[in-house]
């Protein structure tokens, strides 16, 4: 056959679906690779063809669209499973072609099993809620297009294994789950089960997401430098190792880039000739506030080094701060024998 633009296996779109549930999978060509949509392609006389390679096989084969109850069907640029089976796992290819044009892409589809508490190998999206912030909601994800707006599904929400059926703090409201106040105890996996009828059959869609309760913007502050501070003086003799920790607390801020850096005499350590190393460690609180520690180390400090200015800097979306470390050369204690000799008037 003639040449075809092959976009290869699109592993960025590792699609996971639950066994025995409906799945609708859009051909990725129109979403990520081509500059036109399916309608334009269709009206231009292009045809969309689907085929697949079973798991652990090399042979490409056509998809069987003649299964009982139309278990697998195609509608426009969507491949439908009503429902999926475990052995539907494999690499699926959609190819758009006519006599003069051809473009195709493959993508992996994994059909996943879940247990009665919705545990599975499925990768879960994470939804962050601000702690004690007022009403916040999560929405049952990826259910658009499964049933028409005239169909009213029933939606049941679970936290872990437990059905949420009261409204003391977390209120199930159809596709939404409303948190009157988000608390650390609300951290966990939330599952919505959407049940809807279609052609005399009942289908279930299961969607699980992880809720992570994080620091509230109401409580966010600019970075706080705990060290260096005015109470600690780094007093060293030449030849000793100089270790200065810069410890900075950052409030959680959505999508904020937290930065810590040292300057020595106003320059970045990379831009000066002294032999300095910097090691960084990061820790997080339960609400994802961050503490970063950068330890500046000079193995054998010189008297010149002890005269330099060492400043720790920190920056977040809330602001920038800096603090200088108090570094000084230790004055050597007078030697006992000399002192004694002077005391007796010896010359």
């Amino acid at each position: 056959s003639e040449r075809c633009d092959d976009w290869g296996l699109d592993t960025m779109r590792q699609i996971q679906v639950f066994e025995d549930e409906p799945a609708r999978i859009k051909c990725p060509l129109f979403e990520h690779f081509l500059k036109f949509n399916y309608s334009t392609a269709h009206s231009a006389g292009l045809t969309l063809i689907w085929y697949w390679t079973r798991q652990d096989r090399d042979l490409e084969e056509p998809i069987n669209f003649r299964l009982p109850e139309n278990r697998i069907s195609k509608e426009k640029d969507v491949l439908w499973f009503r429902p999926t089976l475990l052995n539907d796992t494999g690499n699926y290819t959609c190819m758009l072609r006519n006599t003069t044009y051809c473009s195709k892409v493959a993508f992996p589809l994994e059909v996943v099993q879940k247990d009665s508490c919705f545990n599975s190998p499925m990768k879960l999206p994470v939804h962050k809620l601000y702690i004690e912030y007022g009403i916040q909601r999560i929405t049952c994800p990826n259910v658009d297009g499964y049933f028409p707006s005239s169909v009213k599904p029933t939606i049941t929400w679970y936290m872990g294994c437990y059905k949420i059926q009261n409204f003391n703090n977390v209120i199930p409201e159809g596709m939404n789950l409303s948190f009157l106040i988000a608390l650390i105890s609300n951290n966990g996996n939330y599952t919505c089960v959407v049940t809807y009828p279609e052609n005399g059959r009942t289908f279930h869609l299961t969607r699980t997401l992880t809720v992570k309760v994080v620091g509230s913007p109401k409580n966010a502050v600019p970075p706080v430098i705990h060290s260096p501070n005015d109470h600690v003086v780094y007093e060293k003799e030449p030849g000793e190792e100089l270790l200065i920790p810069c410890t900075v607390y950052f409030s959680f801020l959505m999508d904020s880039r937290n930065e810590v850096w040292w300057t020595i005499d106003g320059k970045k350590p990379d831009d000066i000739t002294i032999d300095v190393t910097i090691n960084e460690s990061i820790s997080h609180s339960r609400t994802e506030d961050e503490t970063r520690t950068q330890i500046l180390s000079i193995k054998k400090v010189t008297s010149e080094d002890l005269k330099r200015s060492y400043v720790c800097h920190a920056r977040s979306a809330k602001g920038e701060v800096a603090k200088a470390a108090k570094v000084k050369q230790k004055v050597p204690a007078p030697r006992y024998t000399v002192e004694l000799a002077c005391g007796f008037g010896a010359t």
Epitope: N168, N169, P172, L180, I181
Partner: antibody, heavy 122, light 111 residues
Framework: QQLEQSGGGLVKPGGSLELCCKA??????????ICWVRQAPGKGLEWIGC?????????YYANWVNGRFTLSRDIDQSTGCLQLSSLTAADTAMYYC??????????????WGQGTLVTVSS | ALVMTQTPSPVSAAVGGTVTINCQAS??????LAWYQQKPGQPPKLLMY???TLASGVPSRFSDSGSGTEFTLTISGLQSDDAATYYC?????????????FGGGTEVVVK
């Protein structure tokens, strides 16, 4: 476990009053909301608002409250209070506090105070 | 705002009989409804919540059904101790507000 209410009584129109609700047998903590409901003589129940007993003390009020009533809580004293101000005769009612547990296993208002009567009259 | 409409009131039945109380919400409140029993001079007592969950210590003679905007409380095998006023409570959130709204109450008279 009980909610003991105090602070009701006779008050003149335009006046103020503070009603309180003390937890006994359990301590008010981040596990609870304290809510207030009132009932005019011979009438039905009317929700006033709720306050979260945890650190933020977040509050929700019924629209009709319009800033006249204020919820507060003192975790150390294990007490929730309702400050009533700009009172009118229409505020004459039995005022109840109720507990709501922050979990998925109990209903809203699983424990109620005995009620305290507020009478607004000149 | 959310409006809860309760019917009928009063309702009466003989001991051993069955009574049904209806509660209608002005908005779709899904299953966010509770039922309370109140006797004269006493605070309300939680009976059921979340549609179908009995509160602790409540006998199984009490049952409820419904979701969305139409709800029903049924008391079967009526006993003289069931004489009381029954209230539904609906909960609804909208943007940053939460509405807890009681129905007007239904008095149950046991003959």
């Amino acid at each position: 476990q009980q909610l003991e209410q105090s602070g009701g009584g006779l008050v003149k129109p335009g006046g103020s009053l503070e009603l309180c609700c003390k937890a006994s047998g359990f301590s008010l903590s981040s596990s609870y909301w304290i809510c207030w409901v009132r009932q005019a003589p011979g009438k039905g129940l009317e929700w006033i608002g709720c306050i979260y007993a945890g650190s933020s003390g977040s509050t929700y009020y019924a629209n009709w409250v319009n800033g006249r009533f204020t919820l507060s809580r003192d975790i150390d004293q294990s007490t929730g209070c309702l400050q009533l101000s700009s009172l009118t005769a229409a505020d004459t009612a039995m005022y109840y506090c109720a507990r709501s547990i922050v979990d998925f296993s109990s209903g809203w208002g699983d424990l109620w105070g005995q009620g305290t009567l507020v009478t607004v009259s000149s | 705002a959310l409006v809860m409409t309760q019917t009928p009131s009063p309702v009466s039945a003989a001991v051993g009989g069955t009574v049904t109380i209806n509660c209608q919400a002005s908005e779709d409140i899904y299953s966010n409804l509770a039922w309370y029993q109140q006797k004269p001079g006493q605070p309300p007592k939680l009976l059921m919540y979340g549609v179908s969950t009995l509160a602790s210590g409540v006998p199984s003679r009490f049952s409820d059904s419904g979701s969305g905007t139409e709800f029903t409380l049924t008391i079967s095998g009526l006993q003289s101790d069931d004489a009381a006023t029954y209230y539904c409570l609906g909960v609804y959130t909208y943007i940053s507000d939460v509405y807890y709204t009681f129905g007007g109450g239904t008095e149950v008279v046991v003959k």
